[in-house]
């Protein structure tokens, strides 16, 4: 499994954002898939469950991404995105994606910094 | 086999409200985000509404905002797009697609004239 | 908005010519572009996303490249049956935004 993400992000406090996240794989995508969100402040302190998918998405019951996270992947198009919306500044840090896809092997975890800012500066 | 089956167009007059609906079948409905797009008389094709799966967090473009509202029943396996105040550029052939446009239905024609 | 700006507007050609449609973003749309086939009479149907993917079921003829702000759509050897309109679509950024469409014909 190869996975690709954007890498680094900027987004507006307030504003929704989607974390994107798309992989390849030799195996074809079936109930075995699985994908795991986690989250580690940019300040240090432990990794945070974000989100799990397998069949169908789990959003977290509890903590700091209750009722502000949904899933917005396709398996068919390899896409295991999330929408994390009303953004904070501390949610700044890195959030992480996990896919298996067995029987493919386990790839690397993608990762996307993202930082939470006031405004987006134009840049066009 | 993905299906996405809708329903509900017609002739309305201007200021006039309607409802559209959307069967979904063939898919696990719950696990994605839908969208509503239209195509005018002219096949020009635009975006109007779309609802994330979980809470149903929802986004419109400017054109529509306020006036119409997407909404979904997942026990139903059944989309919605509730259109008020109507205008005569709503007229067009109304989508309903699955996630970000991978399975689009057959449509249904919305016409808004006095 | 972000404008998908799509050329050209018609395209006749012969059964076996390659074809390439060009779309143009206002601003980067990184490679959230997808291509859209709409034949006589029906309804949209995804050819590639992501910039470059094929969607399930789509023959390899259909191509897709581009990153940022320009992107290509080709069609490797024309067939009869590919007589029908073609959109680019950006999902970058709501409100997700429309090429004009390209109308390919068969000679």
């Known amino acids: 499994v190869e996975i690709y993400t954007s890498g680094a992000l900027e987004a507006v406090n307030g504003t929704d954002v989607r974390l994107k996240c798309t992989f390849s794989s030799f195996a074809p995508v079936g109930d075995a898939l699985t994908v795991t969100w986690n989250f580690r402040p940019r300040d240090g302190g432990r990794e945070q469950f974000v989100f799990y998918y397998h069949m169908d998405p789990f959003r977290p019951m509890s903590g700091r991404f209750k009722d502000r996270v949904v899933w917005d992947g396709n398996p068919e198009r390899y896409d295991v995105s999330i929408l994390l919306w009303k953004l904070q500044f501390d949610d700044n840090g890195t959030y992480t994606c996990q896919v298996k896809n067995p029987p493919d092997v386990d790839g690397l975890v993608g990762t996307i910094r993202l930082s939470v800012v006031h405004t987006v500066p134009f840049s066009e | 086999e993905v299906k996405l089956v809708e329903s509900g167009g017609g002739l309305v007059q201007p200021g006039g409200s309607l409802k559209l609906s959307c069967a979904a079948s063939g898919f696990t409905f719950s696990s994605y985000t839908m969208s509503w797009v239209r195509q005018t008389p002219e096949k020009r094709l635009e975006w109007v509404a779309y609802?994330?799966?979980?809470?149903?967090?929802?986004y419109y473009p400017d054109t529509v905002k306020g006036r119409f509202t997407i909404s979904r029943d997942n026990a139903k396996n059944t989309l919605y797009l509730q259109m008020s105040s109507l205008k005569s550029e709503d007229t067009a052939m109304y989508y309903c697609?699955?996630?970000?446009?991978?399975?689009w239905g057959q449509g249904t024609s919305v016409t808004v004239s006095s | 908005s972000i404008v998908m700006t799509q050329t050209p507007k018609f395209l006749l050609v012969s059964a076996g010519d390659r074809v390439t449609i060009t779309c143009k973003a206002s601003?980067?749309?990184?490679?959230?572009v997808a291509w859209y086939q709409q034949k006589p009479g029906q309804s949209p149907k995804l050819l590639i996303y992501y910039a470059s993917n094929r969607f399930t079921g789509v023959p390899d003829r259909f191509t897709g490249s581009g990153y940022g702000t320009d992107f290509t759509f080709t069609i490797s050897t024309v067939q009869a049956e590919d007589l029908a309109v073609y959109f680019c679509q950006q999902d970058y950024s709501s409100p997700w935004t429309f090429g004009g469409g390209t109308k390919l014909e068969i000679k």
């Open positions: 609802i994330t799966t979980g809470a149903g967090r929802t």
């Open positions: 697609a699955r996630h970000r446009g991978d399975y």
């Open positions: 601003q980067s749309v990184s490679n959230d």
